[in-house]
Interface confidence: low
């Protein structure tokens, strides 16, 4: 708290301007009218105030707006945003994407701070869903943003927003997150032709079910091994040798290098050895010829 003291004669601020940088903290408190500050917030960013002086300015705004700042003030906070606590931000009602962009710009180049996380949370909750423009903005500032959301939060992402997602935005997503995002991507890209569709859906395939992989195998997509290795094991296991061959196209030769790794290793265990032999890759570990498979789900091969 800054002690209440009278403003010295002739020091009352009529404008928010550079002369204020020479004011002591108590003079700023006494001589700057909070309402004036609120209407001229856009000037604060251009003035090299010290952190201590910014503390005083924040204190004045807090007194003027105890229930939370109006958006007209928030949009022009600039570096004063860095002084806000998550508790302060929870009082705000930010609805304009321009306001969001302005505040994210202040934090640009830094990791997502608790303040930014709270701001984004307030903004998204205010909008009711993570629309395309918002997602576009957030992933531009924080490529890993999408994967920082819980599966529950991702469920509020409308399929139309998926168009804003770039492959690198999904780099750190775990399987549970891709399980939520994949059906949305499938819906978003459903009207594209085969090859274009595959280019767009590829990054999301870690959440794809078996039937979709079977469908892709009929479309000459030539999936690369890196994508194949990220597929859900339970989705890969039911695929036949012929389906995997069609799915991978010329990349099928890469299976040999991956034969000891999931999901390839587990898939091999489910295939007949004579089917595997048709690939000519020397893959070993399939069900011996002449064995009768009674229960594939148990991965048991009995004679």
């Amino acid at each position: 708290e800054v002690e209440k003291t009278a403003c010295p004669s002739g020091k009352k601020a009529r404008e928010i301007d550079e002369s204020l940088i020479f004011y002591k903290k108590w003079e700023l408190e006494a001589c700057v009218d909070a309402a004036l500050l609120a209407t001229q917030m856009d000037r604060v960013n251009a003035i090299p105030f010290t952190y201590e002086q910014l503390d005083v300015l924040k204190h004045k705004l807090d007194e003027l707006y105890p229930q939370g700042y109006p958006e007209s003030v928030i949009q022009h906070l600039g570096y004063l945003f860095l002084k806000m606590s998550p508790e302060d931000i929870r009082k705000w009602n930010v609805t304009s994407l321009e306001t969001l962009k302005a505040l994210l710009e202040v934090n640009k180049g830094h990791e997502m701070s608790p303040q930014v996380a709270t701001l984004i949370d307030r903004f998204v909750k205010g909008r009711g869903q993570l629309d395309k423009d918002t997602l576009d903005t957030l992933t531009a500032f924080y490529p890993g943003y999408l994967c920082s959301l819980s599966p529950e939060e991702l469920s509020s992402v409308p399929p139309s927003s998926i168009w804003a997602v770039r492959p690198q935005d999904l780099d750190t997503c775990d399987p549970r997150q891709l399980d939520v995002l994949y059906p949305k991507a499938r819906l978003a890209f459903q009207n594209m032709n085969g090859s274009e569709y595959f280019v767009k859906i590829q990054s999301f395939l870690g959440g794809a079910p078996t039937e979709d992989l079977k469908a892709l195998s009929q479309q000459n997509v030539s999936m690369d091994l890196a994508t194949f290795m990220k597929l859900r094991t339970d989705a890969v296991l039911p695929l036949t040798v012929a389906e995997v061959q069609k799915l991978l196209g010329p990349h099928v030769e890469g299976l040999k290098a991956e034969e000891r790794h999931r999901p390839v290793r587990d898939w091999i265990l489910r295939q007949r050895q004579d089917d595997l032999d048709t690939l000519g890759l020397g893959l070993q570990g399939g069900i011996p010829n002449g064995y009768l498979v009674l229960d594939l789900s148990m991965q048991e091969a009995l004679s």
Epitope: S148, T172, D179, T233, R260
Partner: antibody, heavy 122, light 109 residues
């Protein structure tokens, strides 16, 4: 029997670097697992550092790590290393490695190593 | 961020009594919660995963419950061997996380 064992713990100077190794034995390292590092300062609680997938290049780490710690793996050696740089006294702890089976059922660490002590002091 | 808050920090129990430890997540983590027991000089031991599933070889005196943000570990018929520190751990996500573990609860018997 499946086992994890950490090694490399030592007394190290502030601002120094150190690499810890987690060796997996009796464990098919080409299978799908996450090997994770967790530390515990003397008399304090458990603190998650990060995890590395034994096959894919996926690495996830706690937000406080900030690039100071790097997790790498060698499939042929069956090891996962934790390379620590710019060490401070606050990094003094017992460092454990633990295994999480790679599935869709959440993270939990069924198998732990005994731990290795790192002391940062001049 | 997903922060885990454990209460109480320590608790005393008589042999044969019951101990209840609570764990609160700052956001919903569904049922992705594990409980561990740790004794001095030893690594943690998994007791319960997915909020209520008992790990192999763990006594049925340990019971986990809860979902969403509120979870409970109950130890009934407390024995001397139960004296240890107990930790909860969220297994929901590893993205944008400071620590997956709660602060721990010391149990004195």
């Amino acid at each position: 029997q499946e086992q994890l064992e950490e090694s490399g713990g030592d007394l190290v100077q502030p601002e120094g670097s150190l690499t810890l190794t987690c060796k997996a034995s009796g464990l098919d390292f080409s299978s799908s697992y996450w090997i994770c590092w967790v530390r515990q300062a003397p008399g304090k609680g458990l603190e998650w550092i990060g995890c590395r997938h034994t096959f894919t290049a996926n690495t996830w780490s706690a937000s406080w790590v900030n690039g100071r710690f790097t997790i790498s793996r060698s499939t042929s050696l069956g090891t996962v290393d934790l390379k620590m740089t710019s060490l401070t006294a606050a990094d003094t702890a017992t460092y454990f490695c633990a295994r999480d089976e790679s599935n869709n059922d959440g993270w939990d660490f069924k198998l732990w190593g005994p731990g290795t002590l790192v002391t940062v002091s001049s | 961020a997903y922060d885990m808050t454990q209460t109480p920090a320590s608790v005393s129990a008589a042999v044969g009594g019951t101990v209840t430890i609570k764990c609160q997540a700052s956001q919903s983590i569904s049922n992705y919660l594990a409980w561990y027991q740790q004794k001095p000089g030893q690594p943690p031991k998994l007791l319960i995963y997915q909020a209520s599933t008992l790990a192999p070889g763990v006594s049925s005196r340990f019971k986990g419950s809860g979902s969403g943000t509120e979870f409970t570990l109950t130890i009934s018929g407390v024995e001397c061997a139960d004296a240890a520190t107990y930790y909860c751990q969220q297994g929901y996500t590893s993205s944008n996380v400071e620590n997956v573990f709660g602060g721990g609860t010391g149990v004195v018997v």
